[in-house]
């Protein structure tokens, strides 16, 4: 096994707001990550960088620094929030996300996350990519892995 294992668990919550004038959607997406330290000593998680893509366009980025210290043979669950904006050339989504005649306004987003840890004289980076459903029509709290989008063309990593 890797000395450090990173597992993207899923979307924990998505909080939505709109700007009707600009036909813009603001989504604050909180994701959950499990980081396991298989070393015999504590390891520093130096940073987590994340970005969210919609339709191959980056709609949000986030970076967390000096996250945590993980003890030997231990695991920590970390939540991180990526503020996203769906606007401009994607403002057509405003109509879909605010449509009252449908209950669930799921869109497919690609979550990318890179975890950087200090390990044996160098910084080790571990990346994960996952497609997830997010409801852009209301504030939603998800059961972990509930929002997973299974796409045979994009198998889980």
């Amino acid at each position: 096994p890797r000395s450090i294992e990173v597992k993207y668990i899923g979307v924990k919550s998505a909080y939505v707001s709109y700007d009707a004038e600009k036909r813009t959607i603001y989504l604050n997406i909180t994701n959950t990550l499990n980081i396991t330290n298989n070393n015999y000593y504590s390891v520093e998680v130096e940073n987590i960088t994340a970005q969210v893509q919609f339709s191959k366009t980056v709609i949000g980025k986030a970076r967390l620094n000096n996250i945590t210290n993980i003890g030997p043979l231990d695991m920590k669950q970390i939540d991180y929030t990526v503020p996203t904006v769906i606007a401009e050339e994607m403002s057509y989504m405003y109509d879909f996300c605010t449509l009252l005649s449908i209950k669930v306004h799921n869109i497919v987003l690609m979550m990318q996350v890179t975890v950087t840890t200090a390990y044996f004289g160098h910084s080790e980076q571990i990346s994960q990519e996952r497609y997830q459903y997010v409801d852009c029509g209301r504030n939603t709290t998800y059961q972990l892995a509930q929002s997973e989008y299974l796409n045979v063309l994009q198998p889980q990593q």
């Epitope: 000395s3 396991t36 298989n38 070393n39 015999y40 000593y41 504590s42 003890g71 030997p72 043979l73 231990d74 695991m75 200090a118 390990y119 044996f120 004289g121 160098h122």
Partner: antibody, heavy 120, light 112 residues
Framework: QVQLQQSGAELIRPGTSVKVSCKAS????????IEWVKKRPGQGLEWIGV????????NYNEKFKGKATLTADKSSSTAYMQLSSLTSEDSAVYFC?????????????WGQGTTVTVSS | DIVVTQTPLSLPVSFGDQVSISCRSS???????????LSWYLHKPGQSPQLLIY???NRFSGVPDRFSGSGSGTDFTLKISTIKPEDLGMYYC?????????FGGGTKLEIK
């Protein structure tokens, strides 16, 4: 004071399994790792594996994967090692020891050892 | 796996002698944070192994100062300055940095 009290000697038939216990006292059980070590007559010490009792995460010597299973019960501050499909090669004294998370102290306190004899 | 080579296999001594035991690892035992997990143990027949030295050179509580450890990276030494009867037994080094932990083959300290 720190103590690791191991279960008593076992005489086991080949092909069966045995579970050795290691009860910790005198310190915070989940703040230390528990190591397991094998000693056969005329041979050196052999490291089997280690468990973090807080997380339940284990790491094994490749040689003992499938042979030893390490678990821990936080409520009773007891670590366990189950040995399966026993053969005469598994006849040995098995020790548990604790290791500090924070410092470089590995296996500072040891149990008294449990003798496992595999014989028909 | 890290190979830990201990020499000599056997060490015949007289009481009062000073002796050295060597332990060499196939890879550096110093991790990213500068810690080196190298320990020394004495195992006497019918007893549990006892920790003598941890982190290369730190004497464990209650261990007499005639025991000392030194070294860095891949080469380590245990010195016993004045051998006493209670020092006889098997000495082992253990590397605790890399997965899996590995013991040296042992050095038997015995009377000439």
């Amino acid at each position: 004071q720190v103590q690791l009290q191991q279960s008593g000697a076992e005489l086991i038939r080949p092909g069966t399994s045995v579970k050795v216990s290691c009860k910790a006292s005198g310190y915070a059980f989940t703040n230390y790792l528990i190591e397991w070590v094998k000693k056969r007559p005329g041979q050196g010490l052999e490291w089997i594996g280690v468990i973090n009792p807080g997380s339940g995460i284990t790491n094994y010597n490749e040689k003992f994967k499938g042979k030893a299973t390490l678990t821990a019960d936080k409520s009773s501050s007891t670590a366990y090692m189950q040995l399966s499909s026993l053969t005469s090669e598994d006849s040995a004294v098995y020790f548990c020891a604790r290791s500090d998370f924070i410092t470089t102290v590995v296996a500072d306190y040891w149990g008294q050892g449990t003798t496992v004899t595999v014989s028909s | 796996d890290i190979v830990v080579t201990q020499t000599p296999l056997s060490l015949p001594v007289s009481f009062g002698d000073q002796v050295s035991i060597s332990c060499r690892s196939s890879q550096s035992l110093t991790n990213y944070y500068g810690n080196t997990y190298l320990s020394w143990y004495l195992h006497k027949p019918g007893q549990s192994p006892q920790l003598l030295i941890y982190g290369i050179s730190n004497r464990f509580s209650g261990v007499p100062d005639r025991f000392s450890g030194s070294g860095s990276g891949t080469d380590f030494t245990l010195k016993i300055s004045t051998i006493k009867p209670e020092d006889l037994g098997m000495y082992y080094c253990l590397q605790g940095t890399h997965q899996p932990r590995t013991f040296g083959g042992g050095t038997k300290l015995e009377i000439k």
